[in-house]
Interface confidence: medium
């Protein structure tokens, strides 16, 4: 069937996010992908959105992330903007109002986004074939 526009938007946003490193992409987030054997796809998307929201809520105004130069500042602002867009679109795709995030495992934001991009591309290849 036709791929959801939201899925295309998510991949587009993830591509933009993974192109550039910022001062804070090496910070850690909860790794929801480490043990997602019994998790539905919708739950995974919902939990991914929750993790991203936790990240940008904590680090949007983090002076370490904003940096000392204008370029660092704008890169961080762009990162936050894309994370917010990703959060919203993942919520749209999940269609769930809430979901628990209890994992102890951590990964860097950079690795988290790369893993999410792989999952989304796999989903896209299935729905577009």
């Amino acid at each position: 069937h036709k791929c959801d526009i939201t899925l295309q938007e998510i991949i587009k946003t993830l591509n933009s996010l993974t192109e550039q490193k910022t001062l804070c992409t090496e910070l850690t987030v909860t790794d929801i992908f480490a043990a997602s054997k019994n998790t539905t796809e919708k739950e995974t998307f919902c939990r991914a959105a929750t993790v991203l929201r936790q990240f940008y809520s904590h680090h949007e105004k983090d002076t370490r992330c904003l940096g000392a130069t204008a370029q660092q500042f704008h890169r961080h602002k762009q990162l936050i903007r894309f994370l917010k867009r990703l959060d919203r679109n993942l919520w749209g795709l999940a269609g769930l109002n809430s979901c628990p995030v209890k994992e102890a495992n951590q990964s860097t934001l950079e690795n988290f986004l790369e893993r999410l991009k792989t999952i989304m591309r796999e989903k896209y290849s299935k729905c577009s074939s």
Epitope: D4, A49, R85, R88, W91
Partner: antibody
């Protein structure tokens, strides 16, 4: 079909807080992937986005108004509200509530609007 | 913040004329742009989303194009009921409206 209706005082005194409520009928305010926003139009001027609230509960506000704005949702009443503090005459405007998003995406336009309510700031 | 510059601020045209409004973003916004119509005393109405997609139920004489920083909104054949103010709106980073273009009939 979904309808939005703004309500609240038409006159607010300077330095006070403007409070408006938008009641959603014909659908649930909790529906994903939709989001909810407030937009205003001062007399003789253009449209100005005030802020939005999303299914996750996160909010975005216009940077020029951010320090004065709070948007919240009451799912039990199927309503969302706007509070704008420390108002001045410059906040006199028609205030609209609107629904953003579309069936297959959330990052989208404001497709359904309330009819608007005029709020005058004056002593 | 992203600024949206709309031009002209007002125009007058005859029924049947082709009307073109432009909107320029202060930075690249891809195709994250919508166009709205606002009639006096009425709430704004979405006409075009994602720069070029016609909202359901909107007459085909309305169209939009552009990407990046430069966008165009066109009414191919102006009708009396098209008298309104038209706004562009970006949603690439938060939401910003253009200043509006008031369209009148000669």
């Amino acid at each position: 079909q979904l309808q939005l209706q703004e309500s609240g005082p038409g006159l607010v005194k300077p330095s006070e807080t403007l409070s408006l409520t938008c009641t959603v009928s014909g659908g649930s305010i909790s529906s994903i992937p939709y989001y909810w926003g407030w937009i205003r139009k001062p007399p003789g001027k253009g449209l100005e986005w005030i802020g939005s609230i999303y299914p996750s509960g996160s909010t975005d506000y216009n940077p020029s108004l951010k320090s004065r704005v709070t948007i919240s949702v009451d799912t039990s009443k199927n309503q969302f509200s706007l509070k704008l503090s420390s108002v001045t005459a410059a906040d006199t405007a028609v205030y609209y509530c609107a629904r953003g998003g579309a069936r297959d995406r959330i990052d989208h336009a404001f497709s359904i609007w309330g009819q608007g309510t005029m709020v005058t700031v004056s002593s | 913040d992203i600024q949206m510059t709309q031009s002209p601020s007002s125009l007058s045209a005859s029924v049947g004329d082709r009307v073109t409004i432009t909107c320029q973003a202060s930075q690249d916004i891809s195709n994250y742009l919508n166009w709205y119509q606002e009639k006096p005393g009425k709430a704004p109405k979405l006409l075009i989303y994602d720069a070029s997609n016609l909202e359901t139920g909107v007459p085909s004489r309305f169209s939009g194009s552009g990407s990046g920083t430069d966008f165009t909104f066109t009414i191919s054949s102006l009708q009396p009921e098209d008298i309104a103010t038209y706004y562009c709106q970006q949603y690439y980073d938060l939401y910003t409206f253009g200043g509006g273009t008031k369209v009148e009939i000669k």
